[in-house]
């Protein structure tokens, strides 16, 4: 049994880091493998993560963490029974993938403005809470070409757009994702999408 693709890990900078790797053949990850991780810190102990299958030869492990600070460094040991398959380390602050925003809502009752709001996925005491920026994706269910991205570079988790920038009388969907420039993170996963019917009063044309 050998590791084909070494574990790569990302942290949500809160309570979970996710490590993925591939074996050289079909593997029952949860019964055959264990990923041991330990914070490099005085009197810390090793903790065990039981991996799950992620495709035939792929494994994924969700490492529970108390919290994360930039100084943290973890040792990682991948075991198959008594055999050490791989040894590495992981610094969560250098591999951050933020949590996805939630509770995306489209408010259509604000005159002819669409107000999209969502929730910041972090509690106020987390460092990332005040460092997230967002991308909002809006697309038409009827027209695949009608697809747009709005970059929200301010901290408030909301976006206002004129309803008239979208076509009237058809359904749209929106989703939002986040990233943090301070840690040069990857983008989060997209939030679940929300759907609404776009309708607005065409301006009365005078001749």
């Amino acid at each position: 049994m050998k590791v084909l693709q070494e574990p790569t890990c990302v942290s949500d900078y809160m309570s979970i880091s996710t490590c993925e790797w591939k074996m050289n053949g079909p593997t029952n990850c949860s019964t055959e493998l264990r990923l041991l991780y330990q914070l490099v810190f005085l009197l810390s102990e090793a903790h065990t993560c039981i991996p799950e299958n992620n495709g035939g030869a792929g494994c994924v492990c969700h490492l529970l963490m108390d919290d994360v600070v930039s100084a943290d460094n973890y040792t990682l040991d991948l075991w198959a029974g008594q055999q050490l398959l791989w040894k590495g380390s992981f610094k969560p602050s250098e591999h951050v993938k933020p949590r996805a925003p939630g509770n995306l809502t489209v408010h259509t009752n604000v005159s002819d403005t669409l107000l999209l709001t969502w929730s910041n996925p972090y509690p106020p005491d987390n460092y990332l809470y005040n460092h997230l920026t967002y991308a909002v994706n809006i697309w038409s269910e009827n027209d695949p070409a009608d697809f747009r991205i709005y970059n929200v570079t301010y901290l408030e988790p909301s976006l206002r757009i004129a309803a008239s920038t979208l076509k009237s009388g058809i359904s749209y969907r929106a989703r939002v994702r986040a990233w943090a420039q301070c840690y040069n993170t990857t983008w989060s996963e997209w939030s679940p999408s929300t759907k609404w019917h776009n309708s607005y009063r065409e301006p009365f044309e005078q001749h």
Epitope: L42, E45, M65, D67
Partner: antibody
Framework: EVQLVESGGGLVQPGGSLRLSCAVS????????MSWVRQAPGKGLEWVSS????????YYADSVKGRFTISRDNSKNTVYLQMNSLRAEDTAVYYC??????????????????WGQGTTVTVSS | DIVMTQSPLSLPVTPGEPASISCRSS???????????LDWYLQKSGQSPQLLIY???NVAAGVPDRFSGSGSGTDFTLKISRVEAEDVGFYYC?????????FGQGTKLEIK
């Protein structure tokens, strides 16, 4: 009520051995790291060794490395210090102390908040 | 190893007056989580040491509020707002960020 009671001290000749015990009650022993600290006559405090709650992490002062062994028996709520090849400079009062919670991912530290009464080790010919 | 240096080594104080002990570490004892791994202990004559302050500025349970700790990084101070006769003994600072734990030389507080 938290209690730590050391035993096993005594008079021993240079090169001899002693095994100190520290019996603990009043807290969830296996969750906490434990430490040994000593104090030579008329001197200050010197850290000797520490062990994690599960026993997997062990640390020693350079002055005792290779001669002393720390261990624990969580079923007996007891931490031990096996002292071999004793020297005159090991003469001291030995204290055990309750250390940080080590079973969490990041150990949680609240100081060495409880100490035993100490046991005296005298190394002399 | 991190070297801990206390001053003064002897501190005669009049009861009711404040007292202050300094502790300096040769290296930073603050971790990335913002905690200073620096404690203060008091050892009274013939007794085991007792914890006064942990993580730089947290007063241990049962310790009178006349004791306080301050400082960060490498420079720390233990203050007693009004010294009482029962406060006599040796005061030690200790770093527990990394092994080996290291203590200061001790400061002997005595009543004038």
């Amino acid at each position: 009520e938290v209690q730590l009671v050391e035993s096993g001290g005594g008079l021993v000749q240079p090169g001899g051995s002693l095994r100190l015990s520290c019996a603990v009650s009043g807290f969830t022993f296996s969750s906490y790291a434990m430490s040994w600290v000593r104090q030579a006559p008329g001197k200050g405090l010197e850290w000797v060794s520490s062990i994690t709650g599960g026993g997997g992490g062990i640390y020693y002062a350079d002055s005792v490395k290779g001669r002393f062994t720390i261990s624990r028996d969580n079923s007996k709520n007891t931490v031990y210090l096996q002292m071999n090849s004793l020297r005159a400079e090991d003469t001291a009062v030995y204290y055990c102390a309750k250390d940080r919670i080590s079973i969490t991912i990041r150990p949680r530290y609240f100081g060495l908040d409880f100490w035993g009464q100490g046991t005296t080790v005298t190394v002399s010919s | 190893d991190i070297v801990m240096t206390q001053s003064p080594l002897s501190l005669p104080v009049t009861p009711g007056e404040p007292a202050s002990i300094s502790c300096r570490s040769s290296r930073n004892v603050i971790y990335g989580n913002g905690y200073n791994y620096l404690d203060w202990y008091l050892q009274k004559s013939g007794q085991s040491p007792q914890l006064l302050i942990y993580l730089g500025n947290n007063v241990a349970a049962g310790v009178p509020d006349r004791f306080s700790g301050s400082g960060s990084g490498t420079d720390f101070t233990l203050k007693i707002s009004r010294v009482e006769a029962e406060d006599v003994g040796f005061y030690y600072c200790m770093q527990s960020l990394q092994a080996p734990y290291t203590f200061g030389q001790g400061t002997k507080l005595e009543i004038k």
